[in-house]
């Protein structure tokens, strides 16, 4: 019986060349979180392990920064970063909880005139 829920920043937009924080929060469960994985489609971006700390995938280490908290900061954004991002919480004894965030990276002028998905 998995009672937990993942809250995310939902659909967000950011400016090309800028940065964005991806945040998820697991609530409504007392389960022990052992690890959080951040993935983009099928690519692993980063892992935060309760005992071992952060590991950033080598192919992303120049553009991904750990935190704040269990979140992930994406830097030097390109239009190719547009897409789905997933936070995967590994917990005991509940198992796995997954949250989804959709990021749209916009050309600077577009972002200035309407961040369609920006969450206040």
């Amino acid at each position: 019986m998995m009672t937990g829920t993942i809250e995310t920043t939902g659909n967000i937009s950011a400016e090309k060349g800028g940065s964005i924080i991806l945040q998820c929060h697991l609530s409504s469960t007392t389960a022990q979180v052992t690890q959080v994985n951040w993935e983009q489609q099928d690519q692993l971006l980063a892992i935060c392990n309760a005992d071992l700390g952060w590991h950033i995938s080598p192919s992303f280490k120049d553009r991904v920064a750990p935190g704040p908290g269990l979140g992930l900061t994406l830097q030097s954004l390109t239009v190719n970063d547009t897409g789905e991002y997933f936070c995967i919480y590994h917990t005991y004894p509940d198992g796995t909880y997954t949250g989804r965030i959709f990021l749209e990276v916009l050309e600077s002028s577009v972002a200035e005139h309407g961040a369609r998905f920006q969450i206040p």
Epitope: T3, A31, Q32, V33, T34, A50, Y92, P93
Partner: antibody, heavy 120, light 108 residues
Framework: EVQLEEFGGGLVQPGGSMKLSCVAS????????MNWVRQSPEKGLEWVAE??????????HYVESVIGRFTISRDDSKSSVYLQMNNLRAEDTGIYYC???????????WGAGTTVTVSS | QIVLTQSPAIMSAFPGEKVTLTCSAS???????LYWYQQKPRSSPKLWIY???NLASGVPARFSGSGSGTSYSLTISSMEAEDAASYFC?????????FGGGTKLEIK
């Protein structure tokens, strides 16, 4: 073998304050959730407070009857957990146990306890 | 909060007798979050059974646990003198964590 030792119990007047300490030896303290549980003939075993890991931003939880009066904290560098108790009441009397928990390792160890007596 | 009610409060058993202690929850508890502790006089509680049915390290195989939802039990297949103790059920499924009032098991 992991060992826990509590300190700081004793006799205190109603409305007074007391700080309990618990020191762990024999394991990597920072990997474990820490709890305080108390026991009295009137109330039996009663969970009091929990503090999780740095990984969890040191999240704390309390039983309702002590919220605003008790504060749990930890110092991983000293392998210690603390319980600051203010505005003590007669019903806070009991044996206070410090417990060290790692759910996914089926690990759950208790100290020998320290007695707190609230009486005028 | 989830209230755990244990019965009986006190019981005694002959050596070799089968013993069953029960723990009833006021609302459903996931079986993974239901633990049992053993406590002997002048000692602190020891984890005895975790996740409803798994024996903690060093616990004799004559102990077993079962249950789901709101009804759980601890069984000793053949009572021995060293099993005389108090047994407490515990849930950490929701805050506040709670304990049952305990069953004091005596040997006849």
């Amino acid at each position: 073998e992991v060992q826990l030792e509590e300190f700081g119990g004793g006799l205190v007047q109603p409305g007074g304050s007391m700080k309990l300490s618990c020191v762990a030896s024999g394991s990597t303290f920072s990997n474990y959730w820490m709890n305080w549980v108390r026991q009295s003939p009137e109330k039996g075993l009663e969970w009091v407070a929990e503090i999780r890991l740095k990984f969890n931003n040191y999240a704390t939880h309390y039983v309702e009857s002590v919220i605003g009066r008790f504060t749990i904290s930890r110092d991983d560098s000293k392998s210690s957990v603390y319980l600051q108790m203010n505005n003590l009441r007669a019903e806070d009397t009991g044996i206070y146990y410090c417990t060290m928990v790692r759910r996914n390792w089926y690990f759950d160890v208790w100290g020998a306890g320290t007695t707190v007596t609230v009486s005028s | 909060q989830i209230v755990l009610t244990q019965s009986p409060a006190i019981m005694s058993a002959f050596p070799g007798e089968k013993v069953t202690l029960t723990c009833s929850a006021s609302s459903s508890v996931s079986s993974s979050y239901l633990y049992w502790y053993q406590q002997k006089p002048r000692s602190s509680p020891k984890l005895w059974i975790y996740s409803t049915s798994n024996l903690a390290s060093g616990v004799p195989a004559r102990f077993s646990g079962s249950g789901s939802g709101t009804s759980y039990s601890l069984t000793i297949s053949s009572m021995e003198a060293e099993d005389a103790a108090s047994y407490f059920c515990h849930q950490w499924s929701s805050y506040p964590y709670t304990f049952g009032g305990g069953t004091k098991l005596e040997i006849k």
